[in-house]
């Protein structure tokens, strides 16, 4: 089941999926001046059986003689600056992608692919957070988020991570600032369907956290 929302935003942090659950979709996007080949795949899909998972379909880009009309292939002008986040500065949690059954590795690049990857995660996907260069972590718990489904609504758990500037004075554990997630879902807003207290999506993904080998947009 697709996650119909995005991992929460943690200021000054990026996140990465170490492996992708079966059912994950990756848009076949091409860089400016290129387009998907006619009758080419729209998505790559992580599929598999109990013993092996792999990406179905191959993304292929070709030079576009005419203007590329595919929507959102490149970042909007106001998003350009945000989306230049690169790979996390230090190693992520030691998760061996190959050892996770029912998961796919990061797909290899394809020729002339776009500068960002747009993934569509599924319920059960886990992403790991890390502070960007120049910030250090104050942990209150796991620096990870999982997409869960309750009453037919999907939501991501809130990672217990605060990233503070190197020069800032560390706070004592009891004095940590609250998570800066302006539209984070209060615990009181977790009742069942068709009420005004349905799960609200944690703050929509900010591109400052979009990261993988390429910059990544998570859908």
């Amino acid at each position: 089941e697709l996650c119909d929302d995005d991992p929460p935003e943690i200021p000054h942090a990026t996140f990465k999926a170490m492996a992708y659950k079966e059912g994950t979709m990756l848009n076949c996007e091409c860089k400016r001046g290129f387009r998907r080949i006619k009758s080419g795949s729209l998505y790559m899909l992580c599929t598999g059986n109990s013993s092996h998972s792999s990406w179905d379909n191959q993304c292929q880009c070709t030079s576009s003689a005419t203007r590329n009309t595919t929507k959102q292939v490149t970042p909007q002008p106001e998003e350009q600056k945000e989306r230049k986040t690169t790979e996390m500065q230090s190693p992520m949690q030691p998760v061996d992608q190959a050892s996770l059954p029912g998961h796919c590795r990061e797909p290899p690049p394809w020729e002339n692919e776009a500068t960002e990857r747009i993934y569509h995660f599924v319920v059960g996907q886990m992403v790991y957070y890390q502070c960007v260069q120049g910030y250090r972590a104050l942990h209150r718990g796991p620096a990870e988020s999982v997409c869960k489904m309750t009453h037919g609504k999907t939501r991501w758990t809130q990672p217990q991570l605060i990233c503070t500037g190197e020069m800032e004075t560390s706070q004592f554990p009891g004095e940590e600032k609250p998570q800066a997630s302006p539209e984070g879902r209060p615990e009181s807003e977790t009742s069942c369907l068709v009420t005004t207290t349905d799960f609200q999506i944690q703050t929509e993904m900010a591109a400052t956290m979009e990261t993988s080998i390429f910059t990544t947009e998570y859908q």
Partner: antibody
Framework: QVQLVQSGAEVKKPGSSVKVSCKAS????????MHWVRQAPGQGLEWIGY????????EYNQKFKDKATITADESTNTAYMELSSLRSEDTAVYYC?????????WGQGTLVTVSS | DIQMTQSPSTLSASVGDRVTITCSAS?????MHWYQQKPGKAPKLLIY???ELASGVPARFSGSGSGTEFTLTISSLQPDDFATYYC?????????FGQGTKVEVK
């Protein structure tokens, strides 16, 4: 309570465009994707696509990618869907539906009639 | 795309009847969701994640199935249940619906 109120019925000429609105209230607009669904007369439901209101990111059903353009205005908590190059086959009721999983709230629908 | 095939397309039944609607997906999916629609109205969520009843939905409705075959059952049809029912998958894009099953008075 959560409400999605759509704009009124439209009658359009072939080749023209129409912009349908969906005003949300009763929840944090930017916290949920807004999806659009089409229903031609006497037919079933077809998913058109969605928008993430606070980022403007859209995902479309390939069938509608050259037909529909979904936008949103955070300041008015309103999502829009513009249909271009209208043809008689575009005559349908268009619904907005709140995402975040299953579609728990729907607009009342907007009938777009394309006729010369 | 995942195609959703509902059967029957039309079902004639009487109040008190047990009604079963099936939905077959062209590929395996995680869950099925069901909506009810009455003429001139927007669809209404009926059952989510295959078997869970949406808020306010009577217990005479139930859902079951897995993989590619799913079923919606109304144990004892009531006058308010005459409507069109749609199955829906959101396991992969594009999201798709069944063509609908109209439950009409026999």
């Amino acid at each position: 309570q959560v409400q999605l109120v759509q704009s009124g019925a439209e009658v359009k000429k072939p080749g023209s465009s129409v912009k349908v609105s969906c005003k949300a209230s009763g929840y944090t607009f930017t916290s949920y994707r807004m999806h659009w669904v089409r229903q031609a007369p006497g037919q079933g439901l077809e998913w058109i696509g969605y928008i993430r209101p606070n980022r403007g990111y859209t995902e479309y059903n390939q069938k509608f990618k050259d037909k529909a353009t979904i936008t949103a205005d955070e300041s008015t908590n309103t999502a829009y869907m513009e249909l271009s190059s209208l043809r008689s086959e575009d005559t349908a009721v268009y619904y907005c539906a709140r995402g975040g999983g299953v579609f728990d709230y729907w607009g009342q629908g907007t009938l777009v009639t394309v006729s010369s | 795309d995942i195609q959703m095939t509902q059967s029957p397309s039309t079902l004639s039944a009487s109040v008190g009847d047990r009604v079963t609607i099936t939905c077959s997906a062209s590929s395996s999916i995680s869950y099925m969701h069901w909506y009810q629609q009455k003429p001139g109205k927007a669809p209404k969520l009926l059952i989510y994640t295959t078997s869970e009843l949406a808020s306010g939905v009577p217990a005479r409705f139930s859902g079951s199935g897995s993989g590619t075959e799913f079923t919606l059952t109304i144990s004892s049809l009531q006058p308010d249940d005459f409507a069109t029912y749609y199955c829906h998958q959101r396991s992969t894009y594009p999201l798709t619906f069944g063509q609908g099953t109209k439950v009409e008075v026999k």
